[in-house]
Structure formats: C-alpha cells, structure tokens
C-alpha cells in the first residue's frame, strides 16, 4: 500500500498537527513536495527540510536534537518532487530507518529561512501486518499546494 501525503501549508491536518497515517510493514509513505505552476504565491514558495524526530521534537516542532534526523529537502517548488519511505523492519541502506510494529514515528518540516512555510507535522503509526497489495491513500490533495 502506498500512502501519499501532500506536504504543504494548505494541508490543514499537517498544519494542526493531527495528521496520523497508519502503515503496515512493506507499505510506502510518499511525501509530495509543494509544487507551483507559474510564478507561485505572492509571499513566495514553500521550501523546507523534513525530519524524523522524537516526541519532544514533534511537540515543540524542533529538529535540533540528536534524535532529529534530516530525511529530505523540498527545495524545488517549480519541479515535481516526491520522496518515498519504505516501512520495513530491516533496512539495507545506511541512511534508511528500521520501523517497528506497534511504534509511532514523527515527521516535521522546518521552513527554510527564506520560505513562507509553517511548521507541519505528521505521525506515522506502524501496524503489525506485512502487506502485499498496491493501493494509494492520500493525505491532502495536490490542489492544496
């Protein structure tokens, strides 16, 4: 299963901090960066770095501690950029994360200094079963960029 999250300030759940997606092992979390056609908004485009953080980092929307790992950067607002996280128990990659069933993981975005963005937050709850099927569950929509 692929869970698509449109990561931008127009996504009210990310903005409120009550967005929770439930994923199973072998699912994918697809993060879609903000994308603008034409000149973009008058206040400027949203650009930011996305971090996996611990609970205190999620609560305070801070990504500066030793448990705040930079995952991706959304810095090309006029291109189509998407990142994927595979929810797996063991990772073959040194920069990958190992996800444990029953645990919750926290993602936040920290706007770059020149960006118009705000703090956005997402909780990822990892469930127990391994899944094989391919389907998509979006959070937000592309029109919310």
């Amino acid at each position: 299963v692929r869970h698509v999250v449109y990561w931008n300030s127009s996504n009210p759940r990310l903005l409120r901090g009550d967005a929770v997606v439930e994923l199973g092992l072998n699912d994918y979390l697809d993060i879609v960066c903000p994308h603008y056609e034409g000149p973009g908004p008058p206040e400027g485009p949203e650009t930011f770095a996305l971090y996996m953080v611990d609970w205190p980092g999620y609560e305070s929307c801070q990504a500066e501690g030793p448990r705040a790992f930079k995952r991706w950067v959304c810095s090309l607002p006029f291109g189509h950029v998407q990142f994927s996280e595979k929810i797996q128990r063991f990772t073959p990659f040194s920069l990958g994360f190992e996800f444990l069933p029953g645990e919750t993981y926290y993602y936040i975005s920290v706007p770059t200094p020149e960006s118009s963005g705000q703090c956005l937050r997402l909780q990822v709850s990892v469930c127990c079963k391994e899944r094989k099927s391919e389907s998509a569950h979006p959070v937000g929509s592309p029109g919310e960029s």
């Epitope: 971090y51 611990d54 609970w55 205190p56 305070s60 801070q62 990504a63 500066e64 501690g65 030793p66 705040a68 790992f69 930079k70 645990e103």
Partner: antibody, heavy 120, light 112 residues
Framework: QVQLVQSGAEVKKPGASVKVSCKAS????????IHWVRQAPGQGLEWMGW????????KYNERFKGRVTMTTDTSTSTAYMELRSLRSDDTAVYYC?????????????WGQGTSVTVSS | DIVMTQTPLSLSVTPGQPASISCRSS???????????LYWYLQKPGQSPQLLIY???NRFSGVPDRFSGSGSGTDFTLKISRVEAEDVGVYYC?????????FGGGTKVEIK
C-alpha cells in the same frame, strides 16, 4: 532543585538479575529522557541506553540488548534499569542521568551511583 | 561503534598553568541535522560526572570561563586556561551523534 536518588549497593551471584532504581524530583519527570551509564572499577564510562518517560520509548546500546530493560513508573517519578544474566564483568557503578532538552541535549544531572558487585 | 580517542591519558599541571585535552572520533560527529553532539564531562574523585561543555563549545551553567571547548568534524579540544586545584579529576569527551553514544577513555588531570 533537580535530584536523582538511586537505590543502594547490591551484591549478586553470576547468572542473577539486578534492578536499580532512580527516583527523580524537582522537575517534570515525563518531559526528560533518563539515561543509564555504567563505570567498571578503575575504568571509564559506558552508555547503556535511554528511556523517555513521556511515552516509554527506549534505545539500548546493542552491547546490552536482550539483557537490559529500562522502565519508568510515572506515578512515583522513578526510573528502573534491570540487567539480567549477570557476569563478573558487570561489576560496576551504575548511574542514572537526566538529559536536558534544547539547547543542551546533554546529561546535566546525575544520580549518586549504585554499586553492583557480581561475585560467586 | 564510534571510537573516541583521548590524549593524553594523564596530565600533571602546575596551578595557574594552562592544560589542553584532545579528543578524536573515528567518524565525523556532524549529525544529519547539522549539529555536532560532542560534550565534555569531568568526574571528580569519588563523585558522579558533571557536565562542562555541551555541543562542542558551549559552557554549561555554573562552569567557570577558564574552561573552553573547540573543534569540528572529528577533532575536538578542551582547554583550561589556568588550572586550579579543584579541577583535578578525569575528563571525558562524549558523543551523541551516532548510536550507541560513546565516551572517550578519559584523561586524568592532577596538580603538580
């Protein structure tokens, strides 16, 4: 003022388990990580792992995985570290320490230490 | 695991003289978030360790300004500008960038 008070010295036989307690006061217990660090006689410091009392998340040093369990009782603001299958080289002073948050992310307050002796 | 190598192992210093302790890590201590989680602790005889320096160069509250930390990447230094009798003990560097978090082997400072 912040204080971490640990349980008293223990003498254990090889193969046994020990559970050391660390009672916190003077701050909001659920808002700070608690670490466990040990020091063998005449040796340096070794980080064992941490627990976050706010959600009970733990991270253990792989060297102790399977033998160590860190828990907390939020009703009494007490952290516990249990070490199983004790060996003679587990003889050490065991410290609990609080990790302060931003901007430090450092172990700023330490317990007085608990001496654990493993001997047959 | 990250190996933290401290030099020298011991140091005998005349009061009022400077002292310098080096700490070298087996890998860069720059975290993916850009911060460097390198700390210095002092363990006085018969006491628990106490925090001196956090994140490379910041003095913890109550730490005298004769203590300073510097460095980047894999090489770090703790300097005491004028050693006093109360500074005796074992100094440890400590990294929290990579799990497992690891301490250096310690540097024993004594007064001549």
């Amino acid at each position: 003022q912040v204080q971490l008070v640990q349980s008293g010295a223990e003498v254990k036989k090889p193969g046994a388990s020990v559970k050391v307690s660390c009672k916190a006061s003077g701050y909001t217990f659920t808002g700070y990580y608690i670490h466990w660090v040990r020091q063998a006689p005449g040796q340096g410091l070794e980080w064992m792992g941490w627990i976050y009392p706010g959600n009970f998340n733990t991270k253990y040093n792989e060297r102790f995985k399977g033998r160590v369990t860190m828990t907390t009782d939020t009703s009494t603001s007490t952290a516990y570290m249990e070490l199983r299958s004790l060996r003679s080289d587990d003889t050490a002073v065991y410290y609990c320490a609080r990790e302060d948050g931003s901007p430090y992310y450092a172990m700023d307050y330490w317990g007085q230490g608990t001496s654990v002796t493993v001997s047959s | 695991d990250i190996v933290m190598t401290q030099t020298p192992l011991s140091l005998s210093v005349t009061p009022g003289q400077p002292a310098s302790i080096s700490c070298r890590s087996s890998q860069s201590l720059v975290h993916s978030n850009g911060n460097t989680f390198l700390y210095w602790y002092l363990q006085k005889p018969g006491q628990s360790p106490q925090l001196l320096i956090y994140r490379v160069s910041n003095r913890f509250s109550g730490v005298p300004d004769r203590f300073s930390g510097s460095g980047s990447g894999t090489d770090f230094t703790l300097k005491i500008s004028r050693v006093e009798a109360e500074d005796v003990g074992v100094y440890y560097c400590f990294q929290a960038t990579h799990v497992p978090w690891t301490f250096g082997g310690g540097t024993k400072v004594e007064i001549k």
